[in-house]
């Protein structure tokens, strides 16, 4: 392969290592949880916001909203941070695809239903467009063995 391709590979690899894709994972998972509760089955009891991850309100992780945020507020915060991260891949479509594949791989084991998996893939494919970025033309998001988890 040509030298510039190898350089491109290395550049993509270092971009992926630098990127923090957690906000993307959090945004997407909250979105499909929210959709599941709205349309997929009987809604869960609405006494607290069921759409943001549960946790200690004193946590300092800037990517995790308090469970007491208004419905969906945490998710839009994640989306904004996610778009900032994906913006780094704007000029490299192949690398953008690898970032999306990494997100899919990290979350695939969390998705134990066909519908949930398909919806996650749909939302993931739409993510660059939602961020006002160009989506990769061809990007295979299939995960063969159910994925490798990052805890």
């Amino acid at each position: 392969r040509q030298q510039w391709e190898l350089q491109g590979d290395r550049r993509c690899q270092s971009q992926l290592e630098r990127a923090n894709l957690r906000p993307c994972e959090q945004h997407l998972m909250q979105k499909i949880q929210r959709d599941e509760d709205s349309y997929g089955r009987d809604p869960y009891s609405p006494s607290q916001d069921p759409y943001s991850p549960s946790q200690d309100p004193d946590r300092r992780d800037p990517y995790s909203p308090s469970p007491y945020d208004r419905r969906g507020a945490g998710s839009s915060q994640h989306q904004e941070r996610c778009c900032n991260e994906l913006n780094e891949f704007e000029n490299n479509q192949r690398c953008m695809c690898e970032a999306l594949q990494q997100i899919m791989e990290n979350q695939s084991d969390r998705l134990q239903g066909r519908q949930q998996e398909q919806q996650f893939k749909r939302e993931l494919r739409n993510l660059p467009q939602q961020c006002g970025l160009r989506a990769p033309q061809r990007c295979d998001l299939e995960v063969e063995s159910g994925g490798r988890d990052r805890y």
Partner: antibody, heavy 118, light 111 residues
Amino acid sequence: EVQLVESGGGVVQPGRSLTLTCVGSGFNFDDYTMHWVRQRPGKGLEWVSSIRYNSVRIEYVESVKGRFTTSRDNAKNSLYMEMKSLRPEDTAFYYCVKDNGFRSFEIWGQGTMVIVSS
Amino acid sequence: EIVMTQSPLSLPVTPGEPASISCRSTQSLEHSNGYHYLDWYVQKAGQSPQLLISLGSKRASGVPDRFSGSVSGTDFTLKISRVEAEDVGVYYCMQALQTWTFGQGTKVEIK
């Protein structure tokens, strides 16, 4: 109504085999991961095995690896667990369980009893 | 393997009074997606277990709002705001981060 019905339990001698069957109804069986969970007499719950909706990933608790084999036939809405080289400590109530799509055990069958004794 | 430890193992309760059960994991149950993979189940006498709370604090369909779940690091709590006679049974926490493992169970009975 979503329902899971287990069958195949019974009394078996140590070292012998048994196959449990679970039939699902009231939901799209081929859309969900399914699990087997067991409960020894008077004891707590123990996850035993899971199989993804498309069978690409099958997992087992360490104590049954190499002895138990989980499979499914989506055309028959059926889940199976073949249990070989059974031991007295495998004596338990075995429940078939439907995943909710996010790793939670949403629907449980009524269970089937397996007794391993000479 | 993640080990789940519940306390107390036995909980005598008075109807109308609050009750809480604790569960501790040997490691964080928070996934990179921000969710805590901790569920609560109840098994009533002679019945199969049923899901009460998923992902730390999300009440399952049909579960009364007197049940709530909370998370603080590796400590998880199931609270019943006002115990009713029908709440007696064995309560289990379960982690779903890496495969699945249950706590030993807490037997809730009327005083």
